[in-house]
């Protein structure tokens, strides 16, 4: 009776009980990852004069205590709000740069325009990026060997939810001209099922936001197509006009041109076409 | 839709010499052009392009030897320094995009002879 | 530089015959399919045979075919007509908005 009302709190059925050692079809937990976060978290707090308030062994725990012991399909946003709290957090107004399958260069966008900010630019984004992690019901181990796939296993694991956890918030809190960063290289230059389609467009603000720019950047090939009248582009412009913010739309031909001019607005080459 | 050539002649070695593409039935703010020459007897050799963003391209070879600007109808090719080996017929093409990537509407060509 | 390399100067084949052109590229073309072929008969300007590796341009008898993916490429002409005989380039697009041409291939019809 008391092992059911552990089951029956946890939602899990008896068919999903774990074995002694779950194996899922995602790669482990990222090796050294309490470690990992914790040197992340001073990093980041030392570097960051309005985060030096904050105890990074209180983070760590809050980060632990959000999947240790629990089943890792059976993970709720609600099992991060301890963690969030304490990442608290504001960007400026104008400054959000949100990304879609492009990550790499809105990094290298943020690294030459300081003042503006990705989520991974944000305490709790740059604690996670790039890592893997779970734990195992009624243990208090991490996961090394595997974890579960998005696809393949479960939505609702630690990785995914943590990501449309502070996903959400972070669109939630941005004001003014929100900006996004699309890779115009893909099928869908806006899909629906990114985190960015799924999770921060319903959660902007229209009461804060003005409005959406998005770039859409053109792969290693610049051709001449005005990729902002692009099928799918032209759904996230009814997606957000429909939440009463304003959308507006660029082209961004040469990706390396456009960060060397973010670099150099003086130089001559950038009057000219980006 | 169509592209023509024009503005070739002959010349002599070093004086500079602009070729124009004239366009219709389309708009050069959302097309590329190509400039592509075919020396006597040879085959085709791809010079440069212009985008509609006014992004240019060049081949390695060509760089410094040729210029390639647009106005709203047309797209110019200057030869900055010709020599006898840029004796050549100069065709212009549009460039396709995407999933449609080729060459799909030339010019019949304009001959430019370089000769002392 | 990025190379497109027609290993054959000419071919020929009779009447209601099939020919093949290959062109092979020293890297790949941007997105494995930036790849198109023309054909190039004296005194007519140049005409856009294949676009995309495979996409037949509108226009063009499906006699003319379009094959290959990333570096290795293939234009086949089957029954061929006296109307064929040409010269046959494959022009290549590469990452970086560079392009290239192959050195052409004539076509001979017996």
């Known amino acids: 009776s008391g092992l059911n009302d552990i089951f029956e709190a946890q939602k899990i059925e008896w068919h999903e009980l774990p074995r002694w050692r779950q194996q899922w079809s995602g790669s482990g937990t990222t090796s050294r990852f309490p470690e990992t976060v914790l040197a992340r978290c001073v990093k980041y707090t030392e570097v960051h004069p309005e985060m030096r308030h904050v105890d990074c062994q209180s983070v760590w725990d809050a980060f632990k205590g959000a999947f240790i012991s629990k089943y890792p399909c059976n993970i709720t946003e609600e099992d991060y709000q301890p963690l969030v709290k304490l990442g608290t957090q504001t960007v400026p107004c104008n400054k959000t740069l949100l990304w879609s399958r492009i990550k790499d260069l809105a990094h290298q966008f943020t690294q030459v325009q300081r003042d503006m900010f990705t989520l991974e630019d944000m305490l709790l984004g740059y604690l996670a990026d790039d890592l893997t992690w779970c734990g195992e019901f009624n243990t208090f181990e991490i996961n090394y060997q595997s974890c579960p796939d998005w696809r393949k296993d479960c939505s609702n694991n630690p990785v995914s939810v943590f990501w449309k956890t502070v996903s959400r918030r972070f669109a939630e809190t941005a004001c003014g001209v929100v900006h996004v960063m699309l890779n115009g290289s893909r099928s869908k230059i806006f899909d629906k099922n990114s985190t960015f389609g799924s999770v921060e467009v319903h959660n902007l603000q229209p009461e804060k936001v003005q409005a959406l720019e998005a770039w859409v950047i053109h792969g290693g090939r610049e051709d001449s197509r005005d990729l902002c009248q692009d099928p799918t582009i032209k759904e996230l412009e009814s997606i957000i006009s429909k939440r009463n913010i304003r959308f507006f739309c660029k082209n961004i031909y040469r990706p390396d041109k456009f960060l060397q001019c973010v670099k150099n607005p003086e130089d001559s080459s950038c009057l000219s076409g980006i | 839709q169509s592209v023509e050539e024009s503005g070739g002649r002959l010349v002599t070695p070093g004086t500079p010499l602009t070729l124009t593409c004239t366009v219709s039935g389309f708009s050069l703010s959302n097309n590329a052009i190509s400039w592509v020459r075919q020396a006597p007897g040879k085959g085709l050799q791809w010079i440069g392009s212009?985008?509609?963003?006014?992004n240019t391209y060049y081949a390695t070879w060509a760089k410094g030897r040729f210029t390639v600007s647009k106005t709203s109808t047309t797209v110019d090719l200057k030869i900055n320094s010709p020599t006898t080996e840029d004796t050549a017929t100069y065709f212009c093409?549009?460039?396709?995009?995407?999933?449609?990537?080729?060459?799909?509407?030339w010019g019949p060509g304009t001959l430019v002879t370089v000769s002392s | 530089a990025q190379v497109l390399t027609q290993t054959a100067s000419s071919v020929s084949a009779a009447v209601g015959g099939t020919v093949t052109i290959s062109c092979q590229s020293s890297e790949s073309v941007y997105k494995n399919n930036y790849l198109s072929w023309y054909q190039q008969k004296p005194g007519q300007p140049l005409k856009c045979l294949i676009y995309?590796?495979?996409t037949l341009a509108s226009g063009v008898p499906s006699r003319f075919k379009g094959s290959g993916s990333g570096t290795q490429f293939t234009l086949t002409i089957s029954d061929l007509e006296s109307d064929d005989a040409a010269t046959y380039y494959c022009?290549?697009?590469?990452?970086?908005?560079?392009?290239?041409f192959g050195g052409g291939t004539e076509v001979v019809v017996k």
């Open positions: 022009a290549g697009g590469y990452s970086g908005n560079i392009n290239g």
């Open positions: 995309s590796a495979s």
């Open positions: 093409a549009r460039e396709g995009a995407g999933s449609s990537w080729g060459f799909n509407l």
């Open positions: 212009i985008y509609g963003s006014g």
